[in-house]
Interface confidence: medium
Amino acid sequence: ASVATELRCQCLQTLQGIHPKNIQSVNVKSPGPHCAQTEVIATLKNGRKACLNPASPIVKKIIEKMLNSDKSN
């Protein structure tokens, strides 16, 4: 059984990093009864989804940049 069938997590695996120019938006899901881990789900400009590693320094920078751009808009 995969991780997805054990808990209601959406991220089975994570990408270590992705170029920010390919990302349209980022959603950070906090742990809860549905999933014990923090999940970072990026919506790419091509409409697809990708899970990012929340512990990755690159991903942290991407999240920070996205949140800052949201605040300034």
Partner: antibody, heavy 125, light 107 residues
Framework: EVQLLESGGGLVQPGGSLRLSCAAS????????MSWVRQAPGKGLEWVSA????????YYADSVKGRFTISRDNSKNTLYLQMNSLRAEDTAVYYC??????????????????WGQGTPVTVSS | DIQMTQSPSSLSASVGDRVTITCRAS??????LHWYQQKPGKAPKLLIY???NLESGVPSRFSGSGSGTDFTLTINSLQPEDFATYYC?????????FGQGTKLEIK
Amino acid sequence: EVQLLESGGGLVQPGGSLRLSCAASGFTFSELSMSWVRQAPGKGLEWVSAISGSGGSTYYADSVKGRFTISRDNSKNTLYLQMNSLRAEDTAVYYCAREGGRLEPYYYYYAMDVWGQGTPVTVSS
Amino acid sequence: DIQMTQSPSSLSASVGDRVTITCRASQSISDNLHWYQQKPGKAPKLLIYDASNLESGVPSRFSGSGSGTDFTLTINSLQPEDFATYYCQQYYSTPLTFGQGTKLEIK
């Protein structure tokens, strides 16, 4: 053909018990989460409970917590809902639903993409 | 728990019309939202998954949009078989919750 077939519904007195079954066919049952959803007469849909593919994780609506137990037997491709201490407000058609996830690279989601025909449960004295 | 509120609760329209049903979540759910269609005496049927993706076999006149808290289901050029009740459902977190439904009736 992917199919879900519920059974076990019927008339029961308040405080009584009932066990619903849902027989699955046409897909690898053990790989997918399953849910029970109910619909009271003339009302909308209410999620009742869900269970992970292995049966190791279970989830319940507050309205049934402590009274209902969801389980599955992957060797029999069957989902169960044990309903105890039944109340009049539990009267509904009960549906089982497969939570068929779609997998993109590094991403999974859950949607109730296959449903059974429903089994009616009436709680009345 | 996340509350889902649909509007309108009922809607009258004619064949060929374009109709829009809205669903609002009590907190942000990203795009973790599905739309279902249910006809009387039948089980629900998945129409749209993850807010905007058409389920296999569903006619292209159905479309979904939205993210965060506000979502819409649009049916272009209503067909006789589209008169039914429509529900939104969030899966962002448990407990899973449905909207109260929108009944689409023939005018």
